[in-house]
């Protein structure tokens, strides 16, 4: 009878030990299985979860615009006063709804190439007005012409055309015209076949971004989605030195197993450069734990504050010998037009940049850019890309419309907020397929280990107690 009990207790302890050992073994084995599955599923090739979402994003992406309506155009043109602006918006468009095209796998170098078609659909229900709303903004062609032709002879010619077309420093344009293009009356007088259509994003609809060539991750998962080349080149040819490099991914995803200590590098064709984000906080997105990576102020700093940025300072006059910060001259990427990119409302920009403009209210929460990355898969499940488009206008003695200016202005035209969040259905699916499975496996591991240890300890104590009792 005593033997039966003892044998039972030992058997229970052995089962507990086996469960505990199995739970313990399951931890690295399970992690290995998860890693293997993740590695298999994030590869960019036909049949994987990642590929399906990569070809056509399952997220609805909106681009909201706020236009800076100039309140005192005549005063600025006549007296070189501060420019008073009032932002109007949001005007919302649905973007990135088109699938990637010309997808070509290269098994030799483990890359996949594609183009991303551009398209924008106006969303009246998410906008404060219509595409026909009018705004007083800088005359893009008048401001750009003397910058492109810094030649006094040609400026005299251009002045004749500007006067003839009754153009001036500022103009009134509809939202649709300003964003997507209008026939400029001044440029229309140039007697040579030049493009006379002007718009902040012209041309956009029916154009493509790319060709992008990215690593598919088949041979090395730590390179998945990293851009190998853009438009057939590994460099941009816009910046000197390492600033010209195409680094990282396109920000839609990153190689899996993202750590908080990691700097996420990505390339954005909108700003004609590679940039980076650093870990900000852990957040819960529809029940999925994600890491929020934010663009640090350091990325927009002057070379004095961040020496790494020295090669993004390509001109010395407007930048006050590279001491100004928070604006990026992307003219080389825009056919020489004086386009400057910044954060909205000149967030993180030096006071000299925003001083000539009245009506700006920078706000970290509203105007910063962030990426919410699910750390196991590296997928960006939510993002907010915020940037401002500005045009430099300088005094030009030979152009009457600009001759009264006493200083250069970096004039804000508009700012945009491009956002995307994983849908509820997709989030549930993601939880079921990824985080749910990982959680379940973790729970099974802990349960086995816990139950096993408790059983082993309990049965061993009982066995020992029985033995001592019998010994007496």
């Amino acid at each position: 009878m005593g033997c039966d009990r003892n044998c039972g207790l030992i058997a229970g302890a052995v089962i507990g030990a086996v469960l505990a050992v199995f739970g313990g073994i399951l931890m690295p084995v399970g992690d290995m299985l998860i890693e293997k599955t993740i590695k298999r599923e994030v590869v960019l090739e036909e049949g994987t979860t990642a590929f399906k979402n990569w070809v056509k994003t399952g997220t609805t992406v909106y681009r909201q615009f706020w236009i800076f309506d100039v309140q005192n155009p005549d005063d600025v043109a006549k007296n070189s006063s501060k420019i008073k602006v009032k932002q109007r918006g949001p005007y919302t468009y649905r973007v990135r709804y088109l699938a990637k095209e010309n997808i070509t796998q290269d098994p030799e170098d483990h890359t996949v190439s594609f183009v991303q078609p551009n398209g924008a659909i106006f969303e009246p229900s998410l906008s404060v007005g219509t595409e026909d709303d009018n705004f007083t903004v800088l005359n893009l062609a008048v401001a750009a012409a003397p910058h492109i032709y810094q030649n006094s002879f040609v400026q005299v010619v251009l002045n004749s055309l500007i006067k003839k077309s009754k153009s001036s420093m500022f103009q009134t344009r509809s939202l649709k015209e300003l964003l997507w293009g209008y026939k400029d009356p001044f440029l229309s007088l140039v007697p040579y076949p030049i493009s006379t259509t002007v718009g902040v994003f012209y041309p956009y609809n029916d154009t493509v971004d790319g060709v992008y060539k990215v690593f598919n991750g088949k041979d090395n998962i730590s390179k998945v989605a990293i851009i190998e080349s853009y438009k057939g080149k590994r460099n941009l040819s816009y910046w000197p030195s390492y600033c010209d490099m195409i680094n990282g991914t396109d920000a839609a995803s990153f190689p899996p197993f993202v750590e908080k200590s990691r700097t996420l590098r990505f390339f954005s064709s909108d700003i004609c450069r590679s940039i980076y984000a650093v870990f900000g906080s852990e957040i819960d997105l529809k029940g999925i734990p994600v890491y929020r990576f934010v663009l640090p102020a350091n990325a927009f700093a002057s070379p004095l504050q961040n020496p790494d940025n020295h090669c993004f300072c390509t001109e010395k006059v407007i930048s006050n010998n590279c001491t100004s910060y928070g604006v990026l001259d992307i003219g080389k990427c825009k056919e020489g037009k004086p386009v400057y990119i910044s954060l909205p409302h000149f967030l993180h920009a030096s006071p000299d940049v925003s001083e000539p403009i009245e009506g700006l209210h920078p706000n970290e929460d509203e105007h910063r850019t962030y990426l919410d990355v699910e750390p196991i898969t590296g997928f960006t499940l939510q993002f907010a890309k915020r940037l401002q488009v500005n045009i430099l206008v300088k005094p030009a003695r030979k152009i009457e419309a600009l001759k009264n200016l006493k200083r250069p202005y970096i004039v804000p035209i508009l700012w945009l907020n491009e956002t995307g969040t994983i849908g509820d259905e997709k989030a549930e699916m993601f939880k079921t397929q990824v985080t749910g499975k990982i959680k379940l496996l973790g729970m099974v591991e802990m349960a086995l280990l816990g139950i096993g240890v408790v059983m082993f300890v309990a049965f061993m104590i009982s066995y020992c107690a029985c033995k001592s009792k019998n010994g007496k």
């Epitope: 810094q150 030649n151 006094s152 002879f153 005299v156 010619v157 004749s160 007697p191 040579y192």
Partner: antibody
């Protein structure tokens, strides 16, 4: 086809006046602006005057300022160079030329102006 | 005014020779330089604008280079019809100014 044809040259006494014409075809002179360039016998080219597009400003070489006047009649698509107080050193072949960005892509055949007593 | 100094003022060359004419501006004119060819009794003809841009219909043996203050016109292989006088011109600032010319003669 773009063509420029000068006329009005000839022999004139010092202190005299002459009006040169430049008839254009194949393009609108007001869109481009017209220049006059001269070449003294055996010498190089010298820019003389310019009328900017759309009847814009007029510009002159220092050597002719106050004596020469450039004008255009858009209805006739013709440019003119009114030359007063002519001097011996104004003797030259006068060309009219089309330009927009400052280089001359089309030239007339030239008309000879001789200032001599 | 911007002075344009051409050199040499004349040169003798044979058919097939490579000929180089230089032009120096008295101040920076960026790439706003044009080159012309003129034959006796004729109007000048545009060869090159913006220092390097070959005008339509001009043979590819003509090429231009330079930026700032120093510019060059090169004829890679001289042809019989190339014997003429060549002028450079800056189209950066008014008054527009020409070089004094380079006469290319048969050796």
């Amino acid at each position: 086809e773009v063509q420029l044809v000068e006329s009005g040259g000839g022999l004139v006494q010092p202190g005299g006046s002459l009006r040169l014409s430049c008839a254009a075809s194949g393009f609108t002179i007001s869109s481009f602006g017209i220049h006059w360039v001269r070449q003294a016998p055996g010498k190089g080219l010298e820019w003389v005057a310019w009328i900017a597009p759309y009847g814009g400003e007029t510009y002159y070489a220092d050597s002719v300022k106050g004596r020469f006047t450039i004008s255009a009649d858009t209805s006739k698509n013709t440019a003119y160079l009114q030359m007063n107080s002519l001097r011996a050193e104004d003797t030259a072949v006068y060309y009219c030329a089309r330009s927009f960005f400052g280089y001359f892509d089309y030239w007339g055949q030239g008309t000879l102006v001789t200032v001599s007593s | 005014d911007i002075q344009m100094t051409q050199s040499p003022s004349s040169l003798s060359a044979s058919v097939g020779d490579r000929v180089t004419i230089t032009c120096r501006a008295s101040q920076d004119v960026s790439n706003w330089v044009a080159w012309y060819q003129q034959k006796p009794g004729k109007a000048p003809k545009l060869l090159i604008s913006y220092a390097t841009s070959l005008y339509s219909g001009v043979p590819s043996r003509f090429s231009g280079s330079g930026s700032g203050t120093d510019f060059t016109l090169t004829i890679s292989s001289l042809q019989p019809e190339d014997f003429a006088t060549y002028y450079c011109q800056q189209h950066s600032n008014a008054p527009l100014t020409f070089g004094q010319g380079t006469k290319v003669e048969i050796k």
